[in-house]
C-alpha cells in the first residue's frame, strides 16, 4: 500500500539503484517515486555531512522485501515512493530554494526582476529543467538579477552548492503551466532524426508518448510498429532531443508513428501509466511472481497491488489454466518496460497501475460565514482541492468555499446549507482559479446528497461541518484533487505552516473576489482563543487561527473552505472556515472546525453501498 | 493498393447460419489485426469482432457472442465470419476492416455485404 | 463495455458554419478516439485518429480535441461535401464501441 511517512535521523543501508542530487527530501522522494525500480530513498542535507561530494545526495534504493535496514545518521531524511499513493503521486515541484545554487549545464542567462519571473522564464523554455536566480544583494554586482536556465542528462543538478543570495528551483512544466503549448498530433509513416536519448520497447505509440512526457530530456518519439520491416526494431520507442527543441528532419517512412513529448501542455497531462490491456500480446521481462487469477483485469489489479511489479502478462494457454484460473505473470526490468513484445500470442498483457494519479474512488487520509482579507492571489494549481460552491436561483453566485476529499466527495461547513438545503440549486466548480472564468459552457458538479453533522443546529457554531456526495466521480487532474485528512484526534502534530484560501471579502463590508485567495495565518491554542470569545465556547472540536494584531483572516464566502496545514512536505485539511467576529479584527481569530474530531463521521458517511470505506490511509 | 473485399451475405432464415468472407490484398494480411462492423438499415456503426493477427485472440460485441465466430487464413489472406442462429436484428451491412498498427483506429474498409434474415 | 455518447444526434447547418459535435465516453480512454465521416451507402472515412490527429488527405478545416472522457469533433467552416453522419469510436478497450453518430444535414 501508499506509505507516507518521513524518517528522520535514519538512512537504508544497501539497495541502491541511482543517486543524484537533489535539494530537499520531497524532491528526492518525487525522483524515487517515478524511478521505476525505487521504492525506498535515503537523503542527505547539507546540514547531516561534512563531505561536500555526498551534500544533498539523494540515493533511490530498492528491495526485494520492500524495505531495507535503517541505521542512524543525524539529519538524514528516508522514506518510500509514493507509487500505489493516487492523486499525491505528481512530478511538478514549485518549492523555490534560498540560499542554493542547483548546477548545471548553463544555456542561457537573462535579467529578470524576481525569483518567479525566473521560474516562469524556465517553465516557458522548452529545454529548461532547473534554475538559478542571483538576487539583487548577491556579492558580486555584475551577476544580480541574473537568470540562469539549465538543464542536465538526467534532468537533475549535477550538483547543489550553498550559495548566499541565490535562489533556485525547477521548471512548473510537469505542473501543466507552460505557456508553450503543446502538438498533440501523431504522424504516421514518418520518422524523426536528431539524438535519441533513450530506447525502450513499447506496444503502441500512446505508451511511447507518454513515456516521452515523463522522461527528463525526452521533446519527441518515433516509435516503430509491430509491422516494421527490421524485425529486432519492431516496437521500439526512441526518445529524442534536439538543440532546437524540435526535430530538424523528418522522413517518409512505413510504420513508423513520432509525435511530441506532452510535458508543454498547459492544463492537462497525461497520467504518468498506461491502463490499456493488449490482448494477444505477451510482455517478457524479469519474472517477479507467477500467480493463478481469474481474468486479466484481476491480474492488472495483482499487479498494480504488489508495488514492485512493473508489467504482466495474463496466459490464456490450456496448460497454464486450472478451471477458470489462469497464469498471471507478474513481471519488471530496469528500465520500467519490456524487455520483449512478442505479438500472436495466447497471452494479454498490460502494465501496472501504481502510478496512475486517479487512484481508487476514496477519500484521503494520512495516518500518524466567512473571505480572505489580507491575503493575496493564488496561483494555478496551488490548492486543488479547493471548490466553489455557488447557488443558482435567477442568478448564479458564489455562496462558500468545500474542500474535494475524494472523486466524489467534498467537505464543507454546515451552515452553507442555511436555508438553501435543496441540493438542485447548488452548482459545485472544481479546478478554478477565476471566478470570472465560469461561463454557462464551465463544466460543473451537482449535488446528488448533502449530509449535514446530525448535531448541527442553525445559528450554533458546533459541528458546522457537512459532506457533499457528487452525482458523478471527478477525475484527478494537477489542477482538481484532493487534500488529505488528518489522522483521528490528531493532537499531537504542531503545524506551524498553515493557509486559509477562498473567494470570500477581502473586508468586512466588500465583495466576493474573482481571483482566488490565500494567506498563511497561525494557528492559535483554545485557550488563547476562548479568552478572545467569552462569550462563546470555544470546544475541543474547534480550532482557531489568526493573528494577534488582525489584518489576515477568513470573511463571508470564505465559509466552507479549507484551511490546510504542510507537515513534512504533505498538505493536510486541519480546518472548515466557520466562524469568527466580524473579519481579520485584533485579538479576534477565525475559529474553524477542526477536522480531525470528526474523522470517525466522515468515514461513517462516507462508506459506500456496498460497506466498502471510501478512505484510504496512505501510510 | 490495399483492397478489402467482402462477399458471402445474402437472404437467411431467422435461425438460419451463413459465413461472410473477406479477401485482402496490398498488405501483408498476417501483421494486423481485422475486425467486423456491421451497420443495421438507417442505424449507426456496431462493432462486431475483432481477431488478433495470428487468429490466436478473438473478441466479440455482447449482442453476438456465443453465435458469431470470427477466424482467418493468414496464408490465404482471407477473414471470416462465421454466423450461427441468426436473429431479424442481424440484419446489416457487413464490413470487414483493417486496424492499424500502433495508433487502433481503422484505416482501411471493404464495401461491404448486405446480410438480411427474414422469414 | 464502454458507452460512448455523442451530441446532438442530429444538426442542421449551412455552409460556411462553424460546427462541433461532442463525444464522451462512460470511462477515461486517454487519447484513443478517432472519428470517422460516413455519406450514405458508402463504407466509413477516416478522419482524426489518436484524438486530434489528422489523417492524411482530410481537409485542415476538420479538427479533434479532448482526452480522458470528453471530446470534440470541429468543422471550422463547412462546405456542401461535409454533410454526412460522424461516428467517434473509442480503441481503449479491445470491445471497440461507437457513438451513435450525429448525422448533419443542410438547412
Known amino acids: 500500500g501508499c506509505l507516507t511517512q518521513l524518517y528522520e535521523n535514519a538512512f537504508f543501508r544497501g539497495g541502491d539503484v541511482a543517486s543524484m542530487y537533489t535539494p530537499n527530501a520531497q524532491y528526492c522522494q518525487m525522483r524515487c517515486t517515478f524511478h521505476p525500480r525505487c521504492l525506498l530513498f535515503s537523503f542527505l542535507p547539507a546540514s547531516s555531512i561534512n563531505d561536500m561530494e555526498k551534500r544533498f545526495g539523494c540515493f533511490l534504493k530498492d528491495s526485494v522485501t520492500g524495505t531495507l535496514p535503517k541505521v542512524h545518521r543525524t539529519g538524514a531524511v528516508s522514506g518510500h515512493s509514493l507509487k500505489q499513493c493516487g492523486h499525491q503521486i505528481s512530478a511538478c515541484h514549485r518549492d523555490i530554494y534560498k540560499g542554493v545554487d542547483m548546477r548545471g549545464v548553463n544555456f542561457n542567462v537573462s535579467k529578470v526582476s524576481s525569483v518567479e519571473e525566473c521560474q516562469k522564464r524556465c517553465t516557458s523554455n522548452i529545454r529548461c529543467q532547473f534554475f538559478s536566480y542571483a538576487t539583487q544583494t548577491f556579492h558580486k554586482a555584475e551577476y544580480r538579477n541574473n537568470c540562469l536556465l539549465k538543464y542536465s542528462p538526467g534532468g537533475t543538478p549535477t550538483a547543489i552548492k550553498v550559495l548566499s543570495n541565490v535562489e533556485s528551483g525547477f521548471s512548473l512544466k510537469p505542473c501543466a503551466l507552460s505557456e508553450i503549448g503543446c502538438h498533440m498530433n501523431i504522424f504516421q509513416h514518418l520518422a524523426f532524426s536528431d539524438v535519441d536519448v533513450a530506447r525502450v520497447l513499447t506496444p503502441d505509440a500512446f505508451v511511447c508518448r507518454t513515456i516521452c512526457t515523463y522522461h527528463p530530456n525526452c521533446l519527441f518519439f518515433t516509435f516503430y510498429t509491430n509491422v516494421w520491416k527490421i524485425e529486432s526494431q519492431r516496437n521500439v520507442c526512441l526518445l529524442k532531443t534536439s538543440e532546437s527543441g524540435t526535430p530538424s528532419s523528418s522522413t517518409p517512412q512505413e510504420n513508423t508513428i513520432s509525435g511530441y513529448s506532452l510535458l508543454t501542455c498547459k492544463r492537462t497531462l497525461p497520467e504518468p501509466c498506461h491502463s490499456k490491456i493488449y490482448p494477444g500480446v505477451d510482455f517478457g521481462g524479469e519474472e517477479l511472481n507467477v500467480t493463478f487469477v481469474k481474468g486479466v483485469n484481476v491480474c492488472q489489479e495483482t499487479c498494480t497491488k504488489m508495488i514492485r511489479c512493473q508489467f504482466f502478462t495474463y496466459s490464456l494457454l490450456p496448460e497454464d489454466c486450472k478451471e477458470e484460473k489462469c497464469k498471471c505473470f507478474l513481471r519488471l526490468s530496469m528500465d520500467g518496460s519490456p524487455t520483449r513484445i512478442a505479438y500472436g500470442t495466447q497471452g494479454s498483457s498490460g502494465y501496472s497501475l501504481r502510478l496512475c494519479n486517479t487512484g481508487d474512488n476514496s477519500v484521503c487520509t494520512t495516518k500518524t460565514s466567512t473571505r480572505i482579507v489580507g491575503g493575496t492571489n493564488s496561483s494555478w494549481g496551488e490548492w486543488p482541492w479547493q471548490v466553489s460552491l455557488q447557488v443558482k436561483l435567477t442568478a448564479q453566485r458564489h455562496l462558500c468555499g468545500g474542500s474535494l476529499i475524494g472523486h466524489q466527495w467534498v467537505l464543507t461547513a454546515a451552515h452553507c446549507f442555511d436555508g438553501l438545503p435543496l441540493q438542485d440549486v447548488w452548482r459545485i466548480y472544481s479546478g478554478i482559479l477565476n471566478l470570472s472564468d465560469i461561463t454557462k459552457d464551465t463544466p460543473f458538479s451537482q449535488i446528488k446528497e448533502i449530509i449535514i453533522h446530525q448535531n448541527y443546529k442553525v445559528s450554533e457554531g458546533n459541528h458546522d461541518i457537512a459532506l457533499i456526495k457528487l452525482q458523478a466521480p471527478l477525475n484527478y487532474t494537477e489542477f482538481q484533487k484532493p487534500i488529505c485528512l488528518p489522522s483521528k484526534g490528531d493532537t499531537s502534530t504542531i503545524y506551524t505552516n498553515c493557509w486559509v484560501t477562498g473567494w470570500g471579502f477581502s473586508k468586512e463590508k466588500g465583495e466576493i473576489q474573482n481571483i482566488l485567495q490565500k494567506v498563511n495565518i497561525p494557528l492559535v491554542t483554545n485557550e488563547e482563543c476562548q479568552k478572545r470569545y467569552q462569550d462563546y465556547k470555544i470546544t475541543q472540536r474547534m480550532v482557531c487561527a489568526g493573528y494577534k494584531e488582525g489584518g489576515k483572516d477568513a470573511c463571508k464566502g470564505d465559509s466552507g473552505g479549507p484551511l490546510v496545514c504542510k507537515h513534512n512536505g504533505m498538505w493536510r485539511l486541519v480546518g472548515i472556515t466557520s466562524w469568527g467576529e466580524g473579519c481579520a479584527r485584533r485579538e479576534q481569530p477565525g475559529v474553524y472546525t477542526k477536522v480531525a474530531e470528526y474523522m470517525d463521521w466522515i468515514l461513517e458517511k462516507t462508506q459506500s453501498s456496498d460497506g466498502k470505506a471510501q478512505m484510504q490511509s496512505p501510510a | 493498393e490495399v483492397q478489402l473485399l467482402e462477399s458471402g451475405g445474402g437472404l437467411v432464415q431467422p435461425g438460419g447460419s451463413l459465413r461472410l468472407s473477406c479477401a485482402a490484398s496490398?498488405?501483408?494480411?498476417?501483421?494486423?489485426?481485422m475486425m467486423w462492423v456491421r451497420q443495421a438499415p438507417g442505424k449507426g456503426l456496431e462493432w462486431v469482432s475483432v481477431?488478433?493477427?495470428?487468429?490466436?485472440?478473438?473478441a466479440y460485441a455482447d449482442s453476438v457472442k456465443g453465435r458469431f465466430t470470427i477466424s482467418r487464413d493468414n496464408s490465404k489472406n482471407t477473414l471470416y465470419l462465421q454466423m450461427n442462429s441468426l436473429r431479424a436484428e442481424d440484419t446489416a451491412v457487413y464490413y470487414c476492416a483493417r486496424e492499424s498498427s500502433g495508433l487502433y483506429y481503422f484505416d482501411y474498409w471493404g464495401q461491404g455485404t448486405l446480410v438480411t434474415v427474414s422469414s | 463495455d464502454i458507452q460512448m455518447t455523442q451530441s446532438p444526434s442530429s444538426l442542421s447547418a449551412s455552409v460556411g458554419d462553424r460546427v462541433t459535435i461532442t463525444c464522451r465516453a462512460s470511462q477515461s480512454i486517454s487519447s484513443y478516439l478517432n472519428w470517422y465521416q460516413q455519406k450514405p451507402g458508402k463504407a466509413p472515412k477516416l478522419l482524426i485518429y489518436a484524438a486530434s490527429s489528422l489523417q492524411s488527405g482530410v481537409p485542415s478545416r476538420f479538427s479533434g480535441s479532448g482526452s480522458g472522457t470528453d471530446f470534440t469533433l470541429t468543422i471550422s467552416s463547412l462546405q456542401p461535401e461535409d454533410f454526412a453522419t460522424y461516428y467517434c469510436?473509442?480503441?481503449?478497450?479491445?470491445?471497440?464501441?461507437f457513438g451513435q453518430g450525429t448525422k448533419l444535414e443542410i438547412k
Open positions: 469510436q473509442q480503441s481503449y478497450s479491445t470491445r471497440y464501441t
Open positions: 496490398g498488405f501483408t494480411f498476417s501483421g494486423y489485426d
Open positions: 481477431i488478433s493477427s495470428s487468429g490466436g485472440n478473438t
